[in-house]
């Protein structure tokens, strides 16, 4: 006859307030004859949690029908868990005896602890935008979890990051803990459409981690490149000059034309297009009247992007004598 073993498979059981906890206990033998009782704690002061004979355990139910012959499952469910229910629970086999049953064997115990889920991670980026090739910091915070053990990972576009520092507070015993992590991310020019993800895994989440995200579009500034070109073809007595502002982000942009240092107030035609990487292109056309022009016309396209210092590109207008003649001819 095999010796009876009391199997309590979970060493630790994490439960949430208000939920139902299942405490597992199975026996490997029907002998010796006698009941299985549940206690919290050990020694003379242990608390009886369940005895199938007594009817005053309103929150406790059995998983199996204990009255069935050959039943070997003595698992119980405790409903409406409160903080007062924490402790170590033992299923204990008694050998039938007279005048009293004799304790025969105890299970190893299952520690019931209150688990609290972490709050949804909140990811905050830098206060000011930064240009590519620079490093920016993102912080991730989650609160109110228990127990203290928690895993936090950072990702950029699905690739795990390694440059981060994480703290869990407090360091001592507490009913709930908080985590704060700071990741350093090097910005790439194409990061307008990138995301950083903070992923938090905790035992209460049953393998389904929580994620917080931040868009790098909030942290990056891609400065524009400027190119000013003169169109070869002339329209009547006007020459078309183009200022192409390429690959900038965010969209906030002011463009002004100057002619020989004088800001031109007149309307200019322009188009804005979005690139696949999320940056923008801006094209502005400026028509220069050449019928009465001197030879040394300098056009300047000046761009002020996202409140930064203005950048400009100059173009010395090339007007051939032939062009002048044509324009003179065209003038009434």
């Amino acid at each position: 006859e095999e010796e009876l073993q009391m199997i309590q498979p979970e060493k630790l059981l994490l439960v949430t307030v208000g939920k139902t906890a299942t405490l597992h206990c199975t026996v490997t033998s029907l002998l010796p004859v006698g009941p299985v009782l549940w206690f919290r704690g050990v020694g003379p002061g242990r608390e009886l949690i369940y005895n199938q004979k007594e009817g005053h355990f309103p929150r406790v139910t059995t998983v199996s029908d204990l009255t069935k012959r050959n039943n070997m499952d003595f698992s119980i469910r405790i409903s409406s868990i409160t903080p007062a229910d924490v402790g170590t629970y033992y299923c204990v086999k008694f050998r039938k005896g007279s005048p009293e049953n004799v304790e025969f064997k105890s299970g190893p115990g299952t520690e019931m602890a209150l688990g609290a889920k972490p709050s949804a991670p909140v990811v905050l980026g830098p206060a000011a935008r930064t240009t590519p090739e620079h490093t920016v910091s993102f912080t991730c915070e989650s609160h109110g979890f228990s127990p203290r053990d928690i895993t936090l990972k950072w990702f950029k576009n699905g690739n795990e990051l390694s440059d981060f520092q994480t703290n869990v507070d407090p360091t001592g015993q507490s009913v709930a803990y908080s985590i704060r992590s700071t990741a350093r991310v090097v910005l790439d020019p194409w990061d307008v459409r990138s995301q950083v993800i903070c992923e938090v895994a905790h035992v209460t989440l049953q393998g389904d981690p929580l994620r917080g995200t931040a868009n790098l579009s909030e942290a990056i500034r891609v400065p524009p490149t400027l190119e000013v070109t003169q169109q070869p073809m002339r329209v009547g007595n006007q020459v078309n000059v183009t200022c192409q502002v390429r690959k900038f982000y965010p969209q906030s942009l002011q463009l002004t034309w100057s002619e020989n240092g004088n800001v031109c107030q007149r309307e200019t035609a322009s188009t804005l297009t979005e690139n696949k990487d999320g940056t923008y292109n801006w094209t502005s056309w400026f028509l220069v009247n050449i019928s009465d022009q001197r030879d040394d016309v300098v056009l300047t396209c000046q761009v002020k992007h996202d409140g930064q210092l203005a950048v400009s590109k100059r173009l010395a207008l090339e007007v051939t004598v032939h062009q002048k003649d044509q324009s003179s001819d065209a003038t009434p």
């Epitope: 009941p35 012959r69 039938k96 049953n101």
Partner: antibody, heavy 119, light 112 residues
Amino acid sequence: EVQLQQSGTELVRSGASVKLSCTTSGFNIKDYYMHWVKQRPEQGLEWIGWIDPENGDTEYAPKFQGKATMTADTSSNTAYLQLSSLTSEDTAVYYCNAYDGYYGAMDYWGQGTSVTVSS
Amino acid sequence: DVVMPQTPLSLPVSLGDQASISCRSSQSLVHSNGNTYLHWYLQKPGQSPKLLIYKVSNRFSGVPDRFSGSGSGTDFTLKISRVEAEDLGVYFCSQNTHVPLTFGAGTKLELK
């Protein structure tokens, strides 16, 4: 629900024997000691003895040694009490009860079987 | 055998009264395991006895808290704080520390 159902009233002649039954439900009879108690009309309670259905072990009060025989059938969850050589002194209500070593007491009782011995 | 003298044999009460029943044993009821197997049962007319108090002072499942047991060694008491109509009947003390198990003669709780 725990229940102990005892057999019906018995009217027997002096010198004869009678076998009373006690069928349990709501628990496995092997988990308990089954006790038998005698109560004569308008009198107190007298313990007859117990049987452990698990292995058939018995213990009798000296007074009932030779008078009472306790047996049990675990397959039908039934305990039996046989009384032999009946006399008017054996006229009584006989109770079976399930003794649970958790309480250390007779916690569940049958409704009793009335035995009347006539001459 | 352990003798269990129980007093009084009859106890007339009014509803709402406190009632007290005494049970003495001819020898100590403390078992070698340290427990005392002294119990109280109530038998109502036409019914089988029902367990009220086990091991001196523990109320059995479903027993109202107006019932309390106390005592040690050889001297034991059952108290009913406020008698109700459903409490009327015969109260027996019983011991099973020693074999054979023995009962007190019973106390009849009845209305005055």
